[in-house]
Interface confidence: low
């Protein structure tokens, strides 16, 4: 004969556990129903009556099957440097993420606690590592034969144009200026080479290299806002 299906509340067999979406109530010593997401336990079960659930109030939620007496409060409204990517509902917390041009300097379980603007690399420096949702831009000095003339969190160092006749040689922050009317744009096809090896880059002393990596977030946060890294600008 098939085993009888027990209805909550019921006393579990010794050594067994309650079924899915049930919990063991220590006071009643019974397996009782959990409340569904979006609800909470208004009245706990007894030996003769099951859990009474009620809907979460406004600005509160429960995301999981539960038997909590009160719903959790949704997080505070998103700050000006954030966008709300998930609204507060009875079943889910509000999630705030950083708006474009910012990254999450301090995350929380879901979303971001503290956003910070992406570093901008100043002229003479290019982006060596793009910013992500959770990490800042890393700037690097432009290697010989390359330049960046912008203050940007996205621009990388670009090759100087190759001139038939050079009017003004290029440097790390400026493209070469040609006297001829038809410069060969950035390294003639078939003559492209990788950047010079690291050993020769050290001869390229202008601009002064910045640290190759941004300080870790753990360094930054306790000390408050940090000055921009060399080769970068805070704005």
């Amino acid at each position: 004969l098939p085993a009888q299906v027990a209805f909550t509340p019921y006393a579990p067999e010794p050594g067994s556990t309650c079924r899915l979406r049930e919990y063991y109530d220590q006071t009643a010593q019974m397996c009782c129903s959990k409340c569904s997401p979006g609800q909470h336990a208004k009245v706990f079960c007894t030996k003769t009556s099951d859990t009474v659930c009620d809907s979460c109030e406004d600005s509160t939620y429960t995301q999981l099957w539960n038997w909590v007496p009160e719903c959790l409060s949704c997080g505070s409204r998103c700050s000006s440097d954030q966008v709300e990517t998930q609204a507060c509902t009875r079943e889910q917390n509000r999630i705030c993420t950083c708006r474009p041009g910012w990254y999450c300097a301090l995350s929380k379980q879901e979303g971001c606690r503290l956003c910070a603007p992406l570093r901008k690399c100043r002229p003479g420096f290019g982006v060596a590592r793009p910013g992500t949702e959770t990490s800042d831009v890393v700037c690097k000095p432009c290697a010989p034969g390359t330049f960046s003339n912008t203050t940007s969190s996205t621009d990388i160092c670009r090759p100087h144009q190759i001139c038939n006749v050079v009017a003004i040689p290029g440097n790390a922050s400026m493209d070469a200026v040609c006297t001829s009317t038809s410069p060969t744009r950035s390294m003639a096809p078939g003559a492209v080479h990788l950047p010079q090896p690291v050993s020769t880059r050290s001869q390229h002393t202008q601009p002064t290299p910045e640290p190759s990596t941004a300080p870790s977030t753990s360094f930054l946060l306790p000390m408050g806002p940090s000055p921009p890294a060399e080769g970068s600008t805070g704005d």
Partner: antibody, heavy 119, light 106 residues
């Protein structure tokens, strides 16, 4: 001469984890980052993760919960671990060097290691 | 995520023919990178910073574009150019690849 060489188990059972090693030579992991990219049979390339020269990491958010990357600079090795493999994780897994000056995202690639997920 | 859409997915060209393939980004990217891959081989960097040829790439290749629209052109197709070409961006993570354009010889 710059070289990257992947090594892995070849065959992995579903729900099990995968560990692959990329051994590099001709450059230092303290100066260059290393990416992992995979390619399912007959399909395109999918970027997975990079470990940068300073040890920082950037993950493909769609796979982040299943991926872990680390490295041993002294042994010139980068390690990729992937959990809970399914049959659609069957692919050629490549490691590739990141050119830190931003010329190429990936300027040298390994030959790849074939990973088959099957029971 | 930035989605890169390559077209056509498959094309064939005769030797000497001009070939153009495109890569369209779902949002603006600063530069495009291209890789060439032949069967049973690893991808090779082919074009970087949108328009610069990697070492050893023949001068018949060129790249162009900006914003969301990029292209790779071969001025005169040769047998050795038959391969799959992938575009790739690293303006924002994940550093996505296009689905590839397979170029066959007629």
């Amino acid at each position: 001469e710059v070289q990257l060489q992947e090594s892995g188990p070849g065959l992995v059972a579903p729900s099990q984890s995968l560990s692959i090693t990329c051994t590099v030579s001709g450059f230092s992991l303290t100066s260059y980052g290393v990416h992992w990219v995979r390619q399912p049979p007959g399909k395109g390339l999918e970027w997975l993760v990079v470990i940068w020269s300073d040890g920082g990491t950037t993950y493909n958010s769609a796979l982040k919960s299943r991926l872990s990357i680390s490295k041993d600079n002294s042994k010139s090795q980068v390690f990729l671990k992937m959990n809970s493999l399914q049959t659609d994780d069957t692919a050629m897994y490549y490691c590739a060097r990141h050119d830190d000056d931003g010329y190429y995202a990936m300027d040298y690639w390994g030959q790849g290691t074939t990973v088959t997920v099957s029971s | 995520d930035i989605v890169l859409t390559q077209s056509p997915s498959l094309m064939s060209a005769s030797p000497g023919e001009k070939v153009t393939m495109t890569c369209s980004a779902s949002s603006s990217v600063g530069y495009m990178y291209w890789y060439q891959q032949k069967p049973r081989s690893s991808p090779k960097p082919w074009i970087y910073l949108t328009s610069n040829l990697a070492s050893g790439v023949p001068a018949r290749f060129s790249g162009s574009g900006s914003g969301t629209s990029y292209s790779l052109t071969i001025s005169s197709m040769e047998v050795e150019d038959a391969a799959t070409y992938y575009c790739q961006q690293w303006s924002s993570d994940p550093f996505t690849f296009g689905s590839g354009t397979k170029l066959e010889i007629k």
